[in-house]
């Protein structure tokens, strides 16, 4: 259903710069369904629309992703918005799954890699034994020199977080795997919050 | 809610191959991986592989290998599981599970199909 | 493959007992360590993930601990209902593996 996903994109990116201030700051304080997480306050204020649709996705989904949007854009008066995402969500089905699914099957949505990312490029620094155990297998033998060449971990976390896009299940599992072997507090503690 | 349903039991001839279904309703099918079980009579449960409907990824047990083939067909919201060349080793309850999470560290399975029994006798 | 043993296989109690049962990993697994109740003829049941977290509506006189390659799973003040067989499964990494089971039967 990626659909529901360009549609949020492209709500978002239709606000001036003080909406999508505004856009953000209602989202920190929205009612959510039983059992969703709220994204990261620091993370979420300097997110570009881009950042903040790959966010809702992965926290959300899209079915739930795209009704709060639009709970959010009727809350600020953009009606015209909402209504256009209200046609998505009726075109895609959306509707028909998200009132399906019930609070408890979907809380904590997102797979871990896709809703940790701020906190794994800012805490792990053991990458290069993260590198090792995903070269091959996932990474490239280009991908693999490209993330080595960055001289900070945090630099070299981003460089793999922006091959991450293109991978399939298995390889988000692949890492998941990795950072749980070299770095298994961390993952507990983030599995925790 | 939540419901895995499961195809109903099968007698195969050894050398034969059954093709397992496993429908799910009560949420959206391609956001959660789907995972099968082996159990044998008064056995373990052994994990034989997994299927995410969302990119078709699957993730196999070494063991099963060769042995046990994953599919998802998004329009019907169901997962599939074919055996080939089947033995009597192969007899088993086969478990279909949804894990509580996606994406979660714990892999651990919240939801689980009633489970299909497969004989395998001449 | 991460082995995973469990002890005893089977365990005989009377009603209002505690019991314990342990299962052994064969390397570190931390905390990831989920615990399932299958009654005869019935499909397994999540009851703790995680080593000591209870599932949703799962009576609290379920309890599990442990962490690293030792685990237990407690059941206090054991109820008829309690008549199963117990597995233990890793979830640090692939393949997922369980342990043998442990048969409850009430004396």
């Known amino acids: 259903m990626g659909r529901a996903r360009d549609a949020i994109l492209d709500a978002l990116e239709n606000l001036s710069g003080d909406e999508l201030k505004k856009f953000k700051m209602k989202l920190l304080t929205v009612q959510l369904r039983e059992g969703y997480g709220r994204i990261p306050r620091g993370a979420l204020l300097q997110m570009d629309a881009i950042d903040l649709t790959d966010k809702l996705v992965s926290y959300y989904l899209e079915s739930y992703g795209l009704e709060l949007t639009m709970t959010v854009l009727r809350d600020m008066g953009l009606q015209e918005l909402a209504e256009q995402l209200q046609t998505t969500k009726e075109e895609s089905g959306a509707v028909a799954a998200a009132a399906s699914v019930p609070a408890q099957s979907t809380a904590r949505t997102g797979h871990f890699v896709d809703q940790h990312r701020q906190a794994l490029i800012a805490r792990v620094t053991e990458v290069d034994g993260v590198l090792d155990a995903l070269h091959g297998s996932v990474l490239t033998e280009g991908q693999y020199q490209a993330v080595r060449a960055e001289t900070t971990s945090q630099d070299k976390m981003r460089k793999l977080f922006s091959f991450v896009p293109s991978w399939n299940l298995t390889c988000k599992d692949s890492l998941l795997q990795a950072l749980k072997e070299i770095h298994p507090y961390l993952v507990m503690d983030l599995e925790q919050s | 809610q939540v419901q895995l349903q499961q195809s109903d039991a099968e007698l195969v001839k050894p050398g034969g191959s059954v093709k397992i279904s496993c429908k799910v309703s009560g949420y959206t099918f391609t956001d959660h991986t789907i995972h099968w079980m082996k159990q044998r009579p008064e056995q373990g449960l052994e994990w034989i592989g997994n299927?995410?409907?969302?990119?078709?990824?699957?993730m196999y047990n070494e063991k099963f290998k060769g042995k046990a083939t994953l599919t998802a067909d998004k329009s019907s919201s169901t997962a599939y599981m074919h055996l080939n060349s089947l033995t009597s080793e192969d007899s088993a309850v086969y478990f279909c599970?949804?894990?509580?999470?996606?994406?979660?560290?714990?892999?651990?399975?919240?939801?689980w199909g009633q489970g299909t029994t497969l004989t395998v006798s001449s | 493959d991460i082995q995973m043993n469990q002890s005893p296989s089977s365990l005989s109690a009377s009603l209002g007992d505690t019991i314990t049962i342990t299962c052994h990993a064969s390397?570190?697994?931390?905390?990831?360590l989920n615990w399932y109740q299958q009654k005869p003829g019935n499909i397994p049941k999540l009851l703790i993930y995680k080593a000591s977290n209870l599932h949703t509506g799962v009576p609290s006189r379920f309890s599990g601990s442990g962490s690293g390659i030792g685990f237990t799973l407690t059941i206090s003040s054991l109820q008829p209902e309690d008549i199963a067989t117990y597995y233990c499964?890793?979830?640090?990494?692939?393949?997922?593996?369980f342990g043998g089971g442990t048969k409850l039967e009430i004396k």
């Open positions: 499964q890793q979830g640090q990494s692939y393949p997922l593996t």
């Open positions: 390397q570190n697994i931390n905390v990831w």
């Open positions: 599970a949804r894990p509580y999470y996606f994406g979660s560290a714990s892999y651990y399975f919240g939801y």
């Open positions: 299927i995410y409907p969302g990119d078709g990824s699957t």
